[in-house]
């Protein structure tokens, strides 16, 4: 699920101080699998550059070769550069690893734009700023690629954290996280806090660092405020969820909820934007335009192409509405909503006007493959991928960007009937569902 539109940064104030926590439900903690409380060694283990993805440091082989690996919940292959490439400073050298085993099998992954191909093998893998374990995992050694690696991104591979069903070449290739859980006592859960830089970029900061945390094996309470709300994983392929209602500034889009999930809705750390099905996108943009009608912007802005700039510090956040997605809850006829701010869906772009300007792209876009809750959503929240209990949790991120008037929110419960009807049933024909591209 790599490529397409990649990850963003935002502008605004930092999150609330860690001391200012909302009360949690008393029974919540006992329901959480895995270690509880503090995962100090894993906090802040993600890095990246504006628009180029969040990566974690990993080691592969014996002796260990250190590589930066893009964290992608929208795919299921662990794949690393394994041959010289103009955009790679380093790559996996299989011949130098005494523990490499060749599976004598190739893999080819095409995207809407671009592709990668390589050779399958296994080797020993660990995460220095992760759990203190080493596992033997499947590795796709990328030998050829087109429009996959990003110049200057500082990552050399991709860690697909979704399920085996969408692994390439087929679902018999065990994904990394499955191997990790099978070979260790690590609980079958991980969580992501994607933070962004929290400031607009200028020429000297045009490749400013973003940061975040990937907590493997549990939940770190220092990374969120309020309580976690869980939505069921509908099907274990992508991290598929069901959206039951969409609001712009509290105004219901009033669409058949099947439209919101046509043909699926997924949580994907490897996509920048909030991507919406065509009909939903058109309705949402119409509503956002109406809410911000005191100012008009060109069509190219709403298409995510043109930048709109304001004098530094004068971005009129208040004229842009909040976007709320209601997700199916764990209890029958109960939902909860996650609300993002314009600070999430207007993403700062390195200053192409002047250093006195803050410039943004609209980071909600149209999709032909369903809703994709990319970084635009994830940067507002601490997201728990509770694979053990087949659910995804959302709480307000302690590092999300907001202002003094509004904050991202996770709220519930709401009564919503017939939520099962909101899911779209994809006709099963060969591999027609495996649309890998994320344009």
């Amino acid at each position: 699920t790599h490529l397409g539109i990649r990850l963003p940064l935002r502008s605004g104030l930092a999150g609330p101080p860690l001391g200012l926590r909302l009360p949690r439900e008393t029974d919540e903690e006992s329901e959480e699998p895995g270690r509880r409380g503090s995962f100090v060694e894993m906090v802040d283990n993600l890095r990246g550059k504006s628009g180029q993805g969040y990566y974690v440091e990993m080691t592969v082989g014996s002796p260990p070769q250190t590589l930066n690996i893009l964290v992608d919940t929208g795919s299921s292959n662990f794949a690393v550069g394994a041959a010289p490439h103009p955009f790679l400073h380093r790559y996996y050298q299989r011949q130098l690893s005494s523990t490499y085993r060749d599976l004598r099998k190739g893999v080819y992954v095409p995207y809407t734009q671009g592709k990668w191909e390589g050779e399958l093998g296994t080797d020993l893998v660990s995460i220095p700023h992760g759990p203190n374990v080493t596992v033997r995992a499947n590795i796709a050694a990328i030998t050829e690629s087109d429009k996959f690696f990003i110049n200057g991104s500082n990552w050399e591979g991709i860690l697909g954290l979704a399920y085996a069903e969408i692994a390439r070449p087929d679902d018999s290739l065990e994904p990394f996280f499955d191997s990790l859980v099978k070979q260790t006592h690590i609980p079958n859960i991980f969580s992501l806090q994607l933070c962004g830089a929290g400031f607009p970029l200028n020429q000297t900061e045009a490749l400013a660092s973003v940061g975040g945390s990937m907590i493997i094996g549990g939940i770190d309470h220092s990374l969120y405020t309020g309580r976690l709300w869980y939505t069921p994983i509908r099907r274990e392929w992508y991290y598929e969820v069901i959206i039951v209602r969409v609001e712009i500034n509290g105004q219901d889009l009033k669409m058949d909820c099947k439209e919101y999930n046509y043909d699926k809705s997924i949580v994907d750390s490897g996509t920048t934007n909030l991507r919406l099905p065509k009909k939903v996108f058109e309705a949402a943009v119409k509503s956002i335009k109406a809410a911000s009608s005191t100012e008009k912007f060109p069509d190219g802005f709403w298409l995510g192409e043109q930048l709109v700039c304001w004098q530094a510090g004068t971005t009129p956040w208040n004229i842009f509405p909040v976007i709320s997605l209601y997700l199916m809850g764990e209890v029958t006829n109960q939902s909860f909503r996650i609300t993002i701010l314009p600070q999430q869906y207007l993403r700062p772009v390195e200053d192409v006007a002047t250093s006195q300007d803050d410039c943004y792209k609209f980071a909600v876009s149209q999709s032909s493959t369903g809703t994709v809750m990319g970084a635009v959503i994830m940067e507002g929240f601490y997201v728990v991928f509770d694979r053990a209990r087949k659910r995804i949790g959302f709480a307000v991120s302690a590092c999300h960007v907001h202002d003094e008037f509004r904050t991202a929110a996770v709220e519930g419960p709401f009564v919503t009937a017939d939520m099962e009807d909101c899911g779209y049933n994809i006709p099963q024909t060969d591999e027609s569902t495996l649309m890998t591209g994320r344009a």
Epitope: S293, T294, E295, K296, F297, P298, D299, G300, F301, E305, Q306, L307, V308, C309, V352, A353, C359
Partner: antibody, heavy 120, light 108 residues
């Protein structure tokens, strides 16, 4: 047919405020499809965008001039105005008003321009 | 800041000849580029928008091409009234603000 016409003094003293008005005729300044703009051109030189205004009063200014520029709109008179404070000889230019059309992107209609000289 | 560089600064040609004017952006502006014509003592006139679309009333001899960083305005056969200064302008960054320095097309 829509037309734009600039008006105002042709001579302004240094440190004073330059004031110009653009009158829109043959159509309404309140059309939602357009922003209204000021652009200037020093003698023998290129074009410099000064700023835009929407009929609602929403403004955008060139960052390099922002501290000295005010653009306002009077929908009842079908006019928009430019004020540039603390002028110097470097502000001597032909000042054009223009319509920003084609989806708010392009200056598709211009006034004839008025020369403003800053001199004591 | 996106800088638009026009070349050549001056183009000396005869009526009936083909004129090719270049505008190069310091970074990609997609296809968000316009061309203007300005005659002495007159306001600029929009010729081309979105890199290749002719504005209303512009003769077919004017054509625009390019995307990304390199753009071209072509006048297929110069008429006497085409001798003027031509400016390009990018609107990738909005509101529109950046003009090129201009190319003067003069009679040889």
């Amino acid at each position: 047919q829509l037309q734009l016409q600039e008006s105002g003094p042709g001579l302004v003293k240094p440190s004073e405020t330059l004031s110009l008005t653009c009158t829109v005729s043959g159509g309404s300044i309140s059309w939602s499809s357009y922003y209204w703009s000021w652009i200037r051109q020093p003698p023998g030189k290129g074009l410099e965008w000064i700023g835009n205004i929407y009929y609602s009063g929403s403004t955008y200014y060139n960052p390099s001039l922002k501290s000295r520029v005010t653009i306002s709109v009077d929908t009842s008179k079908n006019q928009f105005s430019l004020k540039l404070s603390s002028v110097t000889a470097a502000d001597t230019a032909v000042y054009y008003c223009a319509r920003l059309g084609h989806g708010y992107n392009y200056f598709d209609l211009w006034g004839r321009g008025t020369l403003v000289t800053v001199s004591s | 800041e996106i800088v638009l560089t026009q070349s050549p600064a001056t183009l000396s040609l005869s009526p009936g000849e083909r004129a090719t004017l270049s505008c190069r952006a310091s970074q990609s502006v997609s296809s968000y580029l316009a061309w203007f014509q300005q005659k002495p003592g007159q306001a600029p006139r929009l010729l081309i928008y979105d890199a290749s679309n002719r504005a209303t009333g512009i003769p077919a001899r004017f054509s625009g091409s390019g995307s990304g960083t390199d753009f071209t305005l072509t006048i297929s056969s110069l008429e006497p009234e085409d001798f003027a200064v031509y400016y390009c302008q990018q609107v990738y960054v909005w509101p529109p603000r950046t003009f090129g320095g201009g190319t003067k097309v003069e009679i040889k």
